[in-house]
């Protein structure tokens, strides 16, 4: 569900939304940390209806979801190099 990508691409999000998406409708979350050509952290959400949206990292609801996913993944060993997928 949660992926962290370290790429050498520029920013991919033109605009960000803070509109709430319940986790039941989220298929996958991708996080691109600040740096590597983009001055800001980016969060991209793939929804169950196949649409994709960039989410404001400051939105409280996305922070809650990511915190829950991090807690859930703390018992599983990390996936090495470039891409970290948190089930």
């Amino acid at each position: 569900v949660l992926e962290v990508y370290y790429t050498h691409l520029r920013c991919r999000c033109v605009q960000e939304s803070s509109v709430f998406i319940p986790r039941r409708f989220i298929d996958r979350i991708q996080i691109s940390p600040r740096g590597n050509g983009c001055p800001r952290k980016e969060i991209i959400v793939w929804k169950k209806n196949k649409s994709v949206v960039c989410v404001d990292p400051q939105a409280e609801w996305i922070q809650r979801i990511m915190e829950m996913l991090r807690k859930k993944s703390s018992s599983t060993p990390p996936v090495p190099v470039f891409k970290r997928k948190i089930p």
Epitope: V19, F20, R24, K47, R64, M68
Partner: antibody, heavy 123, light 106 residues
Framework: EVQLVESGGGLVQPGGSLRLSCAAS????????MSWVRQAPGKGLEWVAT????????YYPDNVKGRFTISRDNAKNSLYLQMNSLRAEDTAVYYC????????????????WGQGTLVTVSS | DIQMTQSPSSLSASVGDRVTITCKAS??????IAWYQQKPGKAPKLLIH???TLQPGIPSRFSGSGSGTDFTFTISSLQPEDFATYYC????????FGGGTKLEIK
């Protein structure tokens, strides 16, 4: 008081179409996602569709995807379900239900339901 | 898709009895389960959400527990108005209802 009133049900032949409506009152309709849930005679509940508060996102289970379309008109406080290519197995009472509060971040499920409208698909 | 296995499918009990219904999810749904009561010819009524949070106005004799894949709904002391059909709903990944439990008078 939250009120949801469904209409538009009736008898339709297999392969036919029907449009259900749900009139909402007693809450700020445009702030809530809305869903349709159905119940075949003597059977359990089955989720049919959900639409986000602004109407930009819709979600369906595989068995109705491509046949059913959920929509809403926030100016009229109304929810709709367009049903095409109807089959005998679509026969059910169709309930309109209020879903999550779109302006918040609570993972709440459907809380208020209408009394339902009966759709019968038969030749 | 997540499956919800609800048991028993029917149950006979008497006023004052303690009644327990279980729902088992085919995968981890965290605590995202709700319980509904439905009476014949009526719409479902939400009793509990997020496993154990009681809806406003719902009597405290209704309770829920569990996490992950195994969940329990309990009525501590059955009242005459509690005889109905009960459904669980998972809302962690889209929506799936359990098959229902018909609670009848013994």
């Amino acid at each position: 008081e939250v009120q949801l009133v469904e209409s538009g049900g009736g008898l339709v032949q297999p392969g036919g179409s029907l449009r259900l409506s749900c009139a909402a009152s007693g809450f700020t309709f445009s702030s809530y996602a809305m869903s349709w849930v159905r119940q075949a005679p003597g059977k359990g509940l089955e989720w049919v569709a959900t639409i986000s508060e602004g109407g930009s996102d819709a979600y369906y289970p595989d068995n109705v995807k491509g046949r059913f379309t959920i929509s809403r008109d926030n100016a009229k406080n109304s929810l709709y379900l367009q049903m095409n290519s109807l089959r005998a197995e679509d026969t059910a009472v169709y309930y309109c239900a209020r879903d999550y509060y779109g302006s918040g971040y609570e993972e709440s499920p459907m809380d208020y339901w209408g009394q339902g409208t009966l759709v019968t698909v038969s030749s | 898709d997540i499956q919800m296995t609800q048991s028993p499918s029917s149950l006979s009990a008497s006023v004052g009895d303690r009644v327990t219904i279980t729902c088992k999810a085919s995968q981890d749904i965290n605590k995202y389960i709700a319980w509904y009561q439905q009476k014949p010819g009526k719409a479902p009524k939400l009793l509990i959400h997020y496993t154990s949070t009681l809806q406003p106005g719902i009597p405290s004799r209704f309770s829920g527990s569990g996490s992950g894949t195994d969940f329990t709904f309990t009525i501590s002391s059955l009242q005459p108005e509690d005889f109905a059909t009960y459904y669980c709903l998972q809302y962690d990944n889209l929506y799936t209802f359990g098959g229902g439990t018909k609670l009848e008078i013994k």
